[in-house]
Interface confidence: low
């Protein structure tokens, strides 16, 4: 006859408040005849959790049909878990006796502990915008989880990042833990539409990690490039000059025209367009009056982008029969 073994496979069972916990217990033999009961704790003060024969246990259900004679699975489910339910649970075999059943063998026990889910990760970017090719830091925080073991990953547009540092606090025993991670991200010119994602995986999340995101559009400044050109056609004594401000972000931009150093209020027309990468283009047209009596005209297109130092481009118009375009490098 095979010796009866009481098998409780899980040493530790992590559960979350409000969920259902399954406590497994199987036996290797049907003998001796008698019931299997569940207790929490050991000794005379132990608490009866489930007895198929008698008592009401509204939160407890059995996994198998205990009325079947050949049943060897005495696992139970406990619903609506609360913090008061933590402890070590034992399935215990009794042999029939008179006047009472007699305890025969106990399983090794399963400790039920509360696992707390981490809070939704919060990702914070830099306080100020930075230009491409520079490195910016993003922080990710999640709190209130237990146990301490947790996995955090960073992604940029779906590509996993490797340059980050993570800390879990406190280092010792605690009811709940927090995680903080800082990732260093190199900005690319096309990152206006990019995202960084912080992904947190924890045993309580059952394989469905939590994610926090931040848009790089809030961290990046793409400075504009300027080009001033003179239109070849001339209408009477007017020449059309164009200032093209390309590939900038964010949209915040001030453009002013100067004629021979004097700021002009007039601007014939302007258009703003958005590029596929999220940056903007701004085109401004300026009509210059040219008369034979005038000296050479120097036009300046000055752009102040996102509160940064102004950049400008100059164009010299020679008032001759054959006008000649001439432009210089950008000046601060």
């Amino acid at each position: 006859e095979e010796e009866l073994q009481m098998i409780q496979p899980e040493k530790l069972l992590l559960v979350t408040v409000g969920k259902t916990a399954t406590l497994h217990c199987t036996v290797t033999s049907l003998l001796p005849v008698g019931p299997v009961l569940w207790f929490r704790g050991v000794g005379p003060g132990r608490e009866l959790i489930y007895n198929q024969k008698e008592g009401h246990f509204p939160r407890v259900t059995t996994v198998s049909d205990l009325t079947k004679r050949n049943n060897m699975d005495f696992s139970i489910r406990i619903s609506s878990i609360t913090p008061a339910d933590v402890g070590t649970y034992y399935c215990v075999k009794f042999r029939k006796g008179s006047p009472e059943n007699v305890e025969f063998k106990s399983g090794p026990g399963t400790e039920m502990a509360l696992g707390a889910k981490p809070s939704a990760p919060v990702v914070l970017g830099p306080a100020a915008r930075t230009t491409p090719e520079h490195t910016v830091s993003f922080t990710c925080e999640s709190h209130g989880f237990s146990p301490r073991d947790i996995t955090l990953k960073w992604f940029k547009n779906g590509n996993e990042l490797s340059d980050f540092q993570t800390n879990v606090d406190p280092t010792g025993q605690s009811v709940a833990y927090s995680i903080r991670s800082t990732a260093r991200v190199v900005l690319d010119p096309w990152d206006v539409r990019s995202q960084v994602i912080c992904e947190v995986a924890h045993v309580t999340l059952q394989g469905d990690p939590l994610r926090g995101t931040a848009n790089l559009s809030e961290a990046i400044r793409v400075p504009p490039t300027l080009e001033v050109t003179q239109q070849p056609m001339r209408v009477g004594n007017q020449v059309n000059v164009t200032c093209q401000v390309r590939k900038f972000y964010p949209q915040s931009l001030q453009l002013t025209w100067s004629e021979n150093g004097n700021v002009c209020q007039r601007e014939t027309a302007s258009t703003l367009t958005e590029n596929k990468d999220g940056t903007y283009n701004w085109t401004s047209w300026f009509l210059v009056n040219i008369s034979d009596q005038r000296d050479d005209v120097v036009l300046t297109c000055q752009v102040k982008h996102d509160g940064q130092l102004a950049v400008s481009k100059r164009l010299a118009l020679e008032v001759t029969v054959h006008q000649k375009d001439q432009s210089s490098d950008a000046t601060p």
């Epitope: 509204p58 259900t61 996994v63 609506s80």
Partner: antibody, heavy 120, light 107 residues
Framework: QVQLVQSGAEVKKPGASVKVSCKAS????????ISWVRQAPGQGLEWMGW????????NYAQKLQGRVTMTTDTSTSTAYMELRSLRSDDTAVYYC?????????????WGRGTLVTVSS | DIQMTQSPSSVSASVGDRVTITCRAS??????LAWYQQKPGKAPKLLIY???NLQSGVPSRFSGSGSGTDFTLTISSLQPEDFATYYC?????????FGGGTKVEIK
């Protein structure tokens, strides 16, 4: 779709027995307990008992102990409620209801009810 | 057994009114209370579970509150389809028990 379909109306004489069926579909029958609730004409709701197909667990209202038997057939996803020694005050609509599982004991899915009339 | 007492047994109200129904348990049941709506000839319908959680598909004008022994169901703005009988039910322990019901009638 998710539903509980109950058997049709019954007319019984005092002292007889009635067996009402409740067929579940659209969900895992063994995953949820079933309760039986009755309602006498013009009266409130009265819980009769509870059965969980997974383990065959039952729990009956004290006043019906000995007269009521709840069973399940997992092969057909059907729950049964048998009430014996019928009396005129057993005349009622009998409902089966699924225990929701999202909280303690509450019922998120109900059958349409079976009218049982006990009359001589 | 835990006794559940509902009040009032009936209430007359008009469309747009705020209606409050109370339920008292004879002993503490934590938050394990549900509210149901029943229309004539129909099965009950779960509105609120665990005292304050709105069942999926139920309009947000229904809300529940309370813990321990005293509970409330509130309909913030009564609609024509809300005229029905409402029951509370304790789910803390067997036997499960229901309140006597509150009939919400058209004024």
């Amino acid at each position: 779709q998710v539903q509980l379909v109950q058997s049709g109306a019954e007319v019984k004489k005092p002292g007889a027995s009635v067996k009402v069926s409740c067929k579940a579909s659209g969900y895992t029958f063994t995953g949820y307990p079933i309760s039986w609730v009755r309602q006498a004409p013009g009266q409130g709701l009265e819980w009769m008992g509870w059965i969980y197909a997974y383990g065959g667990n039952t729990n009956y209202a004290q006043k019906l102990q000995g007269r009521v038997t709840m069973t399940t057939d997992t092969s057909t996803s059907t729950a049964y409620m048998e009430l014996r020694s019928l009396r005129s005050d057993d005349t009622a609509v009998y409902y089966c209801a699924r225990e929701a599982g999202s909280s303690w004991y509450d019922f998120d899915l109900w059958g349409r009810g079976t009218l049982v009339t006990v009359s001589s | 057994d835990i006794q559940m007492t509902q009040s009032p047994s009936s209430v007359s109200a008009s469309v747009g009114d705020r209606v409050t129904i109370t339920c008292r348990a004879s002993q503490g049941i934590s938050s394990w209370l549900a509210w149901y709506q029943q229309k004539p000839g129909k099965a009950p319908k779960l509105l609120i579970y665990a005292a304050s959680n709105l069942q999926s598909g139920v309009p947000s004008r229904f809300s529940g509150s309370g813990s321990g022994t005293d509970f409330t169901l509130t309909i913030s703005s009564l609609q024509p389809e809300d005229f029905a009988t409402y029951y509370c039910q304790q789910g803390a322990s067997f036997p499960i028990t229901f309140g006597g019901g509150t009939k919400v009638e058209i004024k």
